[in-house]
């Protein structure tokens, strides 16, 4: 199966959404769990994650084309506690598949702003404020 994971972020006012997107075929969904970890370089797992999403096969989707499933983790107000290194991952023990996305970072600056770095994938950004920068 051709399956991959991407990371992205979007800003809505003071909120920052961290998004893990898994691209997969319809029939590959069952058994997968997508999860987002913080500051876990070697032991990112659903048990140690900030949030997890178990994928389900959607009988309403026809065909075998590539579809996407998203996990969204929302930070309502970014604070220094949110600084760190994040990673999107996915796993299916049923199929023996694990996917590890690129590491990306949130850095809270002394001026009260923050930056998100290391997002190499496509993004759809909605900036309402200039408090945050994504690069």
């Amino acid at each position: 199966g051709c399956i991959n994971i991407t990371s992205s972020a979007s800003q809505e006012g003071t909120r920052l959404n961290l998004i893990c997107t898994v691209w997969h075929k319809k029939e590959e969904a069952e058994g997968f769990v997508v999860f987002l970890c913080k500051d876990r370089s070697g032991d990112c797992s659903p048990e140690t994650s900030l949030k997890q999403l178990r994928l389900k096969r959607d009988p309403g989707i026809d065909g075998v084309g590539e579809i996407s499933s998203q996990l969204m983790f929302t930070i309502s107000q970014v604070t220094p506690l949110h600084s760190g290194t994040y990673q999107c991952c996915a796993r299916s023990q049923k199929s023996g598949i694990r996917l590890q996305g690129h590491f990306f970072s949130i850095l809270f600056t002394e001026t009260g702003n923050y930056t998100v770095t290391g997002l190499k994938q496509r993004q759809h950004l909605e900036f309402s404020h200039n408090e945050g920068t994504l690069s």
Epitope: K94, S95, G96, I97, R98, Q100
Partner: antibody, heavy 112, light 107 residues
């Protein structure tokens, strides 16, 4: 069609090393992972370890010190090596894609 | 390690019976449980994964339920081809561990 076939010696001497091969077809080892399981005759099942699609491995802690799982993706083969075999390692050894598709297994007897 | 305790160890049943077997985990394993059927001389066949998801091609008389520590496999309208040993597997924690099995025999 997904298939997994285990092969190796039927008889191993105590204290020697067991080498088994799992040859897969119908899928790529870079897309799916393989587990090894074993079952002593007439007894229950034991998980031994995993080699994930990305090549990473997880092992049963009870076997970790003497177990190694590797692969050759170009040959669609997964290898199990276990040293210091004892009679209690006599079992049918199975490989499986994830935990869904299983091979038929190969019987390994440890005896002098 | 997580200990999976299956009960009963064996059952004598008749064709058409409703059969229920249990698996108890020594710790919370969420829903990360699979059920297998194994017939003599064959490899285990996956029936249920994630506690209640029926695997492709498995007849709908097989149903899995439960979460946390207590799990059940139910066979409604038992058939002769269902005579086998059934194992539960937890895959929430390493090492993955199996129950000791439940053997179904004809009365």
């Amino acid at each position: 069609e997904v298939q997994l076939v285990e092969s190796g010696p039927g008889l191993v001497q105590p204290s020697e090393t067991l080498s088994l091969t799992c040859t897969v077809s119908g899928f790529s080892l870079t897309s799916y992972g393989v587990n090894w399981f074993r079952q002593p005759p007439g007894k229950g099942l034991e998980w031994m370890g995993t080699i994930w699609n990305d090549g990473g491995t997880d092992y049963n802690s009870a076997l970790k010190s003497r177990l190694s799982i590797s692969r050759d993706t170009s040959k669609s083969q997964v290898f199990l090596k276990m040293n210091s075999l004892q009679t209690e390692d006599t079992a049918i050894y199975f490989c499986a894609r994830g935990f869904e598709y299983w091979g038929q297994g190969t019987l390994v007897t440890v005896s002098s | 390690d997580i200990v999976m305790t299956q009960s009963p160890k064996s059952m004598s049943i008749s064709v058409g019976d409703r059969v229920t077997m249990n698996c108890k985990a020594s710790q919370n394993v969420g829903k990360n449980i699979a059920w297998y059927q194994q017939k003599p001389g064959q490899s285990p066949k996956l029936l249920i994964y994630y506690a209640s998801n029926r695997y492709t091609g498995v007849p709908d008389r097989f149903t899995g339920s439960g979460s946390g520590t207590d799990f059940t496999l139910t066979i409604t309208n038992m058939q002769t081809e269902d005579l086998a040993v059934y194992y539960c597997l937890q895959y929430n924690y390493n090492p993955w561990t199996f129950g000791g099995g439940t053997k179904l025999e004809l009365k």
